[in-house]
């Protein structure tokens, strides 16, 4: 009893339960391949409890090995599109600070018009995590489409 | 000491592990989208720890974020089946209460014959989730091809 | 105040936080269609906390229940490539002790040259994990293409 | 013991129609998907149509699409071929056989047939 | 289509005798394959599925190997009551396709 009273007291943050979920907001200018995210609860069902967005990258605020997960699916596409404009690529990965600049989950789109994986990794407070989507074909932005996560783990 | 003795003694639910994973039941009849699940260590590996079954949906019984995963494989499907048939799209939403209603998770097979995909989202105690296939390709009932499951991440 | 430290003060491995993340080290000579995998941070990003690696192949450590994840991707492949070579199949699953041996998840590659997935599933201690890759085309070993992990949920 | 008997073949004239049906005992009969098979004498086996076991999903062979309708009653253990515009060539024994509970389309259990002769 | 070719078309051995079939898919069908047996008169019988399961009741001479687009089904000690046809058939897509089958006798 002792320890479910302590932890419905100590703030969520505290347990290290740093966890976001984003909606694609919008996509760059040329020669920018990153997306931009948003979250919050105004906007429905994204969120961000612990980590940060940082003029629409998500930035990490607790050290620890994290879940990454994403799914993108191209706007007005169909096996004949994506295979046309192949290759379609999405990477995500530390973009900064640019010492720890590393690619972490790379994905291309071939035939098909989703593309969703997810992958454990350590992330280190201040890291800032950018998707990168190569390719001529535009992101979807429907909430049930296109949608970029992460889930603290463990220290 | 103390704490982990406390762990163990505290009921599983009441630290908010609930977590379920399903396998295919069988399909709705004709103008039924619905795919039905069952769980339960007597059907295999599937199991329901919180959240229980309500005529094959899933209902949820504790209010937080939740990771949902899904994997469908179409059955008898080739690249050339799934393309001779395409659209074909699998959602995962909010079904019940019809004022929660919303998809959660949408995608297509194009040229393949297995999705698979997974996303944080808030849920609440009574949500009911469904899972809706459209087209006219039947999915597999094999419990390592097709699986539906959600695990509770945080309040 | 106490929760927390005493939360600190356990090792990691008391509160079940077992977690690995594999990068690909090679395939198997003909005829073995296993994945041999490595881990640990003079490679990179992959990790080891709790489960071993057993001659490459993934060894769980604490019972409970498992998300296990895996993306591989085909290297020098495109969808002309992958249709060409199909089917190529991945499929995880437990593979000893013998007794226990069964498919976890499988997946086909069709026209595309990458697979992702994840499910949940229970694990025992001693069950060691094998990945099948059966088809004519090599996995890349790019870290960010082809990875393999396990994440302890509960008991 | 599974058990699979099919009824309402015989001889129909070029163009016309028959109603086949296969009664099923010994097994859930909603919980899996179901086939024809038809083999025409000293020839080899050809797959006719599948449906899923709970009638959402249905296949046919490029040969009978537009003549053959496969329909099912769970509630009475049955499967049924309905076959209009019948042509010499659809003449054979055909077979009423049980899908694998998995949904895939191997057949292990097969009734013992009934013969379709088209003639005029 | 899926074409599935059988060879031989039939063959001819001795009691005891290793016998193998092989049907070849004309594209790749990964193991969605089943094996039939086909007795005189009768109706068609299950031996294997998934290209190398056994099926229940059949007997552990019946073996099956392959994947992708060749495969074999070996009886290691042929027996007078395995005289008959064996169908190859593919459920990887439709349409469902067999062999033409293969013809054992005894000689």
């Known amino acids: 009893q002792r320890f479910a009273q302590a932890q419905q007291q100590l703030p969520l943050e505290s347990l290290g339960w740093d966890v976001a979920e984003l909606q694609l907001n919008h996509t760059g200018p040329q020669q920018d391949p990153r997306l931009y995210w948003q979250g919050g609860p105004a906007l429905g069902r994204s969120f961000l409890h612990g980590p940060e967005l940082d003029k629409g990258q998500l930035r990490i605020h607790r050290d620890g090995i994290y879940m990454v997960h994403i799914q993108v699916t191209l706007a007005i596409c169909s096996s004949t599109t994506a295979s046309r404009h192949h290759p379609t690529t999405l990477a995500v990965g530390i973009c900064s600070p640019a010492s720890r600049s590393i690619s972490l989950l790379r994905l291309s789109f071939h035939q098909g018009c989703t593309i969703a994986s997810q992958r454990l990794t350590p992330l280190a407070r201040g890291d800032t995590l950018c998707t990168n989507l190569t390719g001529t074909l535009l992101p979807s932005r429907n909430t049930d489409e296109t949608f970029f996560g992460v889930q603290w783990v463990r220290p | 000491q103390r704490f982990a003795q406390a762990q163990q003694q505290l009921p599983l639910e009441s630290l908010g592990w609930d977590v379920a994973e399903l396998q295919l039941n069988h399909t709705g009849p004709q103008q039924d989208p619905r795919l039905y699940w069952q769980g339960g260590p007597a059907l295999g590996r599937s199991f329901l720890h919180g959240p229980e079954l309500d005529k094959g949906q899933l209902r949820i019984h504790r209010d937080g974020i939740y990771m949902v995963h899904i994997q469908v494989t179409l059955a008898i499907c080739s690249s050339t089946t799934a393309s001779r048939h395409h659209p074909t799209t699998l959602a995962v939403g909010i079904c019940s209460p019809a004022s929660r209603s919303i998809s959660l998770l949408r995608l297509s097979f194009h040229q393949g014959c297995t999705i698979a995909s997974q996303r944080l989202t808030p849920l609440a105690r009574g949500d009911t989730l469904c899972t809706n296939l459209t087209g006219t390709l039947l999915p597999s009932r094999n419990t390592d091809e097709t699986f539906f499951g959600v695990q509770w991440v945080r309040p | 105040q106490r929760f927390a430290q005493a939360q600190q003060q356990l090792p990691l491995e008391s509160l079940g936080w077992d977690v690995a993340e594999l990068q690909l080290n090679h395939t198997g000579p003909q005829q073995d269609p296993r994945l041999y995998w490595q881990g640990g941070p003079a490679l990179g990003r992959s990790f080891l906390h709790g489960p071993e690696l057993d001659k490459g192949q993934l060894r769980i450590h604490r019972d409970g229940i498992y998300m296990v994840h895996i993306q591989v991707t085909l290297a020098i492949c495109s969808s002309t490539t992958a249709s060409r070579h199909h089917p190529t199949t991945l499929a995880v699953g437990i593979c000893s002790p013998a007794s226990r041996s069964i498919s976890l998840l499988r997946l086909s590659f069709h026209q595309g040259c990458t697979i992702a997935s994840q499910r949940l599933t229970p694990l025992a201690r001693g069950d060691t994990l094998c990945t099948n890759l059966t088809g004519t085309l090599l996995p890349s070993r790019n870290t960010d293409e082809t990875f393999f992990g396990v994440q302890w949920v509960r008991p | 013991e599974v058990q699979l008997v099919e009824s309402g073949g015989g001889l129909v004239k070029p163009g016309g129609s028959l109603r086949l049906s296969c009664a099923a005992s010994g097994f859930t009969f909603s919980s899996y998907s179901m086939n024809w098979v038809r083999q025409a004498p000293g020839k080899c086996l050809e797959w006719v149509s599948y449906i899923s076991s709970s009638g959402g999903y249905i296949y046919y062979a490029e040969s009978v699409k537009g003549r053959f309708t496969i329909s099912r009653d769970n509630a009475k253990n049955s499967l049924y071929l309905q076959m209009n515009s019948l042509r010499a060539e659809d003449a054979a024994v055909y077979y009423c056989s049980r899908g694998d509970y998995s949904n895939y389309a191997y057949f292990d259990y097969w009734g013992q047939g009934t013969l379709v002769t088209v003639s005029s | 289509d899926i074409q599935m070719t059988q060879s031989p078309s039939s063959l001819s051995a001795s009691v005891g005798d290793r016998v193998t079939i092989t049907c070849r898919a004309s594209?790749?069908?990964?193991?969605?394959l089943a094996w039939y047996q086909q007795k005189p008169g009768k109706v068609p019988k299950l031996l294997i599925y998934?290209?190398?399961t056994l099926q229940s009741g059949v007997p552990s001479r019946f073996s099956g190997s392959g994947s992708g687009t060749d495969f074999t089904l070996t009886i290691s000690s042929l027996q007078a009551e395995d005289v008959a046809v064996y169908y190859c058939q593919q459920y990887y897509s439709t349409p469902l396709t067999f062999g033409c089958g293969t013809k054992v006798e005894i000689k």
């Open positions: 594209q790749g069908i990964s193991n969605y």
């Open positions: 998934a290209a190398s």
